[in-house]
Amino acid sequence: STGASSHCQKTSLRVNFEDIGWDSWIIAPKEYDAYECKGGCFFPLADDVTPTKHAIVQTLVHLKFPTKVGKACCVPTKLSPISILYKDDMGVPTLKYHYEGMSVAECGCR
Amino acid sequence: STGASSHCQKTSLRVNFEDIGWDSWIIAPKEYDAYECKGGCFFPLADDVTPTKHAIVQTLVHLKFPTKVGKACCVPTKLSPISILYKDDMGVPTLKYHYEGMSVAECGCR
């Protein structure tokens, strides 16, 4: 997601399952850090935002024609799992060690 | 990149290699369609934007706290190669059938 004038980076985002209505099936944890990708994808794109060729092209076009095309976007490029205690189909508390794709591991410009 | 009020989708983006300064080494084509991912990632995220769990969580948090976190971003999730005729290190015109990651194949919310 787009942010202020800082460059694309991973920042903390505490998520409470009750706030998003997932407390009806996730028993624990009550909250977790999902992290968020925040900041701009400015020219020149640094190696740490692991830009694709398309992101580089789009950044160059944006530089030349800012109104024609937007900048590349700072998004999660690698996600991590979390462990959850959830209610299975029968409502029984069940442990999933690796609930995939729930937390940002790395951000990049895409 | 974020767009108007339409939902996340692939749109045409004609790129002229001269405009981005790549004509110095790319002989042909003179231009190509890089495509662009444009539009918003609105709740509820449709299947066609192949949202990750993190994108779904972020969308739900944005819904509850719009000022705390941005929406997920519409970005390329799959890229395609193009064929180029380029000058190699010695300036010899060389054909590369698959110059990877140059064109958007699919967009999604991340």
Epitope: I27, M90, V92, L95 | -
Partner: antibody, heavy 126, light 111 residues
């Protein structure tokens, strides 16, 4: 082979509390829940509650809510059941039993209580 | 009173077949798996049948479980003296969010 070994018999006065322990050996403690089931003399089995040590999350039968506390110590692979405000009707054999909680195990088996501890007799008498 | 209903006692002669019934409701047996436990005199319960009709290793194939609607039953064929025990059915109750047991059935092997 997972084994559950419980603490010894207890004699308690009405109004007091009792804390029974259940030590697990073999297997991974964080892979399972420990449940407590009691059996009054000549009576059937009655589920009291259980705990998932990985998160320290406990849940209880309505009947015992507020009077029972189930805890677990992952470092020693031991679960505890504390029952307060004891009355004579609480005289029973208290069993701990394991239930696998990891969803990597087939649901049919995941919901079974297996194995059980040997039981702890708690006598409440003035 | 137990949530799941079992007959207090059943009996049979050695070699015979006996069945123990367990009746519940849509929120327990009707929508969840049924488990059977055997409790020999003076010992802790032991898992006998899991997931309606599965036997853990070491349990003889003389024991079998079945489920239909909101009822379940345990069948024991070729009855032996060592089968004399209390038998309990058990299921998760989705509505009450608790594990429920039957009142138990005492099996007596005659003769």
């Amino acid at each position: 082979q997972v084994q559950l070994v419980q603490s010894g018999a207890e004699v308690k006065k009405p109004g007091s509390s009792v804390k029974v322990s259940c030590k697990a050996s073999g297997g991974t403690f964080s892979d399972y829940a420990i449940h407590w089931v009691r059996q009054a003399p000549g009576q059937g089995l009655e589920w009291m509650g259980g705990i998932i040590p990985f998160f320290g999350t406990a849940y209880y039968a309505q009947k015992f809510q507020g009077r029972v506390t189930i805890t677990a110590d992952e470092s020693t692979s031991t679960a505890y059941m504390e029952l307060s405000s004891l009355r004579s009707e609480d005289t029973a054999v208290y069993y701990c039993a394991r239930r696998i909680v990891s969803d990597s195990v087939a649901v049919q088996y995941r919901h079974a209580f297996d194995p059980w501890g040997q039981g702890t007799l708690v006598t409440v008498s003035s | 009173q137990s949530v799941l209903t079992q007959p207090p006692s059943v009996s049979g002669a050695p070699g015979q077949r006996v069945t123990i019934s367990c009746s519940g409701s849509s929120s327990n047996i009707g929508s969840n798996y049924v488990y059977w436990y055997q409790q020999l005199p003076g010992t802790a319960p032991k898992l006998l049948i899991y997931g309606n009709n599965n036997r853990p290793s070491g349990v003889p194939d003389r024991f079998s479980g079945s489920k239909s609607g909101t009822s379940a039953s345990l069948a024991i064929t070729g009855l032996q003296a060592e089968d004399e025990a209390d038998y309990y059915c058990n299921a998760w109750d989705t509505k009450a969010y608790v594990w429920v047991f039957g009142g138990g059935t005492k099996l007596t092997v005659l003769g």
